[in-house]
């Protein structure tokens, strides 16, 4: 009789995760009698995948009926493939004995598992930065195979070039992870901007996965301050206005100081949004000049988003206003937020990130 050969016709087989894999193996002779075993890997550490004679292999079935007369087909079917199943599989013929003795191995079939990358997760900086500063965004995706993968960054649809990408591990693995860090220069107009991380992989059939981050989470647009005196009101009252404009985020505290003493503190809330995503706020103070002998120094102090306070001062000239007899107190009205509400919905409008 001819010498037995173990034939594994496919050098490699590629399967999508979740699918089934068929690993083919035929022998050329019924001699010697003995079982076929399938192993993943070679050498002493090889892992038994299927044993024709004994054992329980719930995910593995023989393709042909092993009890069939003259059976020389020992192909197997592995169900519900995962990336952990990747490797080289060997069909090995044994001679019956106590124990069975290995006779010949097939050349091996490499099983590669095509696994989709996880949805990219984009994370931004831990602290906000202001315009003209560079911030870093990180994109991560895991669990894909094969290793080849393409990652691109976009800001508002425009592709970015300043990024660094790593795929790990560098060597052979059942699955891989990608991590990319992009550097983005902020502008004052970026409150509504978005960065997108786009991952393309063979398993995605040309339909890349995207992860996004809003620059509104990363940016701080400091306010402009302007203090002005409105036209003289009756009863020797001067209306001083503090306009706080173009700031983001909304978290802002405004304090009025009269000659260095706290007069009133207000917190910004439920402000309408500008088109560019920033906010404006106006606060005013009514000063009764007849209650003051000297000029009054008014200071509008703004603390924005936990940053050091910004001051803007304005002097009210008392000498320019005649005093009213018997009055020795300053009359102040509480300033209110300058709002132009169109309807109740606007009143409760919040900026969405």
């Amino acid at each position: 009789e001819e010498e037995l050969q173990v034939i594994q016709p496919e050098k490699s087989v590629s399967v999508a995760a979740g699918d089934s894999a068929t690993l083919n193996c035929t022998v050329t002779s019924l001699i010697p009698v003995g079982p076929i075993q399938w192993f993943r890997g070679a050498g002493p550490g090889r892992e038994l995948i299927y044993h024709q004679k004994e054992g329980h292999f719930p995910r593995v079935t023989s393709v042909s009926e092993s009890t069939k007369r003259n059976n020389m087909d020992f192909s197997i079917h592995i169900s519900n493939i995962t990336p952990a199943d990747a490797g080289t599989y060997y069909c090995v013929k044994f001679r019956k004995g106590s124990p069975d003795v290995e006779v010949k191995s097939g050349a091996g079939t490499e099983l590669s598992v095509r696994a989709k990358p996880s949805a990219p997760v984009v994370s931004g900086p831990a602290v906000r930065a202001t315009a003209e500063h560079t911030v870093s965004f990180t994109c991560e995706s895991h669990g894909f195979s094969p290793r080849d993968i393409t990652l691109k960054w976009f800001k508002n649809g425009n592709e970015l070039s300043d990024f660094q990408t790593n795929v790990d591990p560098a060597g052979k693995s059942v699955s891989y992870s990608i991590r990319s860090t992009a550097r983005v220069v902020l502008t004052r107009r970026d409150v509504h901007s978005q960065v997108i991380c786009e991952v393309a992989h063979v398993t995605l059939q040309g339909d890349p996965l995207r992860g996004t981050a809003n620059l509104s989470e990363a940016i701080r647009v400091p306010p402009f301050l302007e203090v002005t005196q409105q036209s003289m009101r009756a009863d020797n009252q001067v209306n001083v206005t503090c306009q706080v404009t173009k700031f983001y985020p909304q978290r802002l505290q405004l304090t009025w100081l009269e000659n260095g003493n706290v007069s009133r503190t207000e917190m910004a809330s439920a402000l309408p949004e500008n088109k560019d995503g920033t906010y404006n706020w106006t606060s005013w103070l009514l000063v009764n000049v007849s209650a003051h002998r000297d000029d009054v120094k008014l200071t509008c102090q703004v603390e924005h988003d936990g940053q050091p306070a910004v001051n803007k001062s304005f002097s009210v000239k008392v000498s320019a206003h005649p005093k009213e007899q018997g009055s020795n107190t300053a009359a102040e009205n509480t300033g209110t937020n300058e709002r132009d509400y169109k309807d109740d919905d606007d009143k409760h409008h919040h900026h969405h990130h």
Partner: antibody
Framework: QVQLVQSGAEVKKPGASVKVSCKAS????????INWVRQAPGQGLEWIAM????????HYNQIFKDRATLTTDTSTSTAYMELRSLRSDDTAVYYC????????????WGRGTLVTVSS | DIVLTQSPDSLAVSLGERATINCRAS??????????IFWYQQKPGQPPKLLIY???NRDSGVPDRFSGSGSGTDFTLTISSLQAEDVAVYYC????????FGQGTKLEIK
């Protein structure tokens, strides 16, 4: 290692039935045929039938086709051979044997069950 | 059905001598490039034991003094140097069709 453990000796009256069991261990029961062979006292070997436990496919010796029935219980890895309408010349040792190579041969044997048919 | 006829029915051979047992089939047992003949040894009070499969292949653990040969319809089991423990009845079996056994050959020491 492969083991086939058979049920104990039986004494039956003519016309009765006997059911011999064969419990397999040391291998995957459904992957190999089980044969049944008998041997009358001082006589040669006589093949009765074979069964594939994976799907209960059977082949019978024409001599026994109408009287013998082979079954298996895969949950307990046990094969059974029932012989009906017993006659005195059915007195024999009944062997189960496993076919390791699907060559319709008998690689591993049980120790046998003596069935005595006597009035 | 294929009928197997063994010869001789019994045989006495001296220790260390060659023993030869023949098995003739009523028609060819060759198929698919194989000769579907098997040889068994049965000692008193024991079940048979497979010695040779597919005419010429020794089963696991069988001493190499046992050999099988032949093709088509004529087959031979040879024990090259008889040992005391070889005393037994020897059966041939075919499986080109459904299994059948020869009538057996009793081997004794002369």
């Amino acid at each position: 290692q492969v083991q086939l453990v058979q049920s104990g000796a039986e004494v039956k009256k003519p016309g009765a039935s006997v059911k011999v069991s064969c419990k397999a261990s040391g291998y995957t029961f459904t992957n190999y045929w089980i044969n049944w062979v008998r041997q009358a006292p001082g006589q040669g070997l006589e093949w009765i039938a074979m069964i594939d436990p994976s799907d209960s496919e059977t082949h019978y010796n024409q001599i026994f086709k109408d009287r013998a029935t082979l079954t298996t219980d895969t949950s307990t890895s046990t094969a059974y051979m029932e012989l009906r309408s017993l006659r005195s010349d059915d007195t024999a040792v009944y062997y189960c044997a496993m076919d390791y190579g699907s060559l319709y041969a008998m690689d591993y044997w049980g120790r046998g069950t003596l069935v005595t048919v006597s009035s | 059905d294929i009928v197997l006829t063994q010869s001789p029915d019994s045989l006495a051979v001296s220790l260390g001598e060659r023993a030869t047992i023949n098995c003739r089939a009523s028609k060819s047992v060759s198929s698919s490039g194989y000769n579907w003949i098997f040889w068994y040894q049965q000692k008193p009070g024991q079940p048979p034991k497979l010695l040779i499969y597919l005419a010429s292949n020794r089963d696991s653990g069988v001493p190499d003094r046992f050999s099988g040969s032949g093709s088509g319809t004529d087959f031979t089991l040879t024990i090259s140097s008889l040992q005391a423990e070889d005393v037994a009845v020897y059966y041939c079996q075919e499986s080109r069709e459904l299994p059948t056994f020869g009538q057996g050959t009793k081997l004794e020491i002369k």
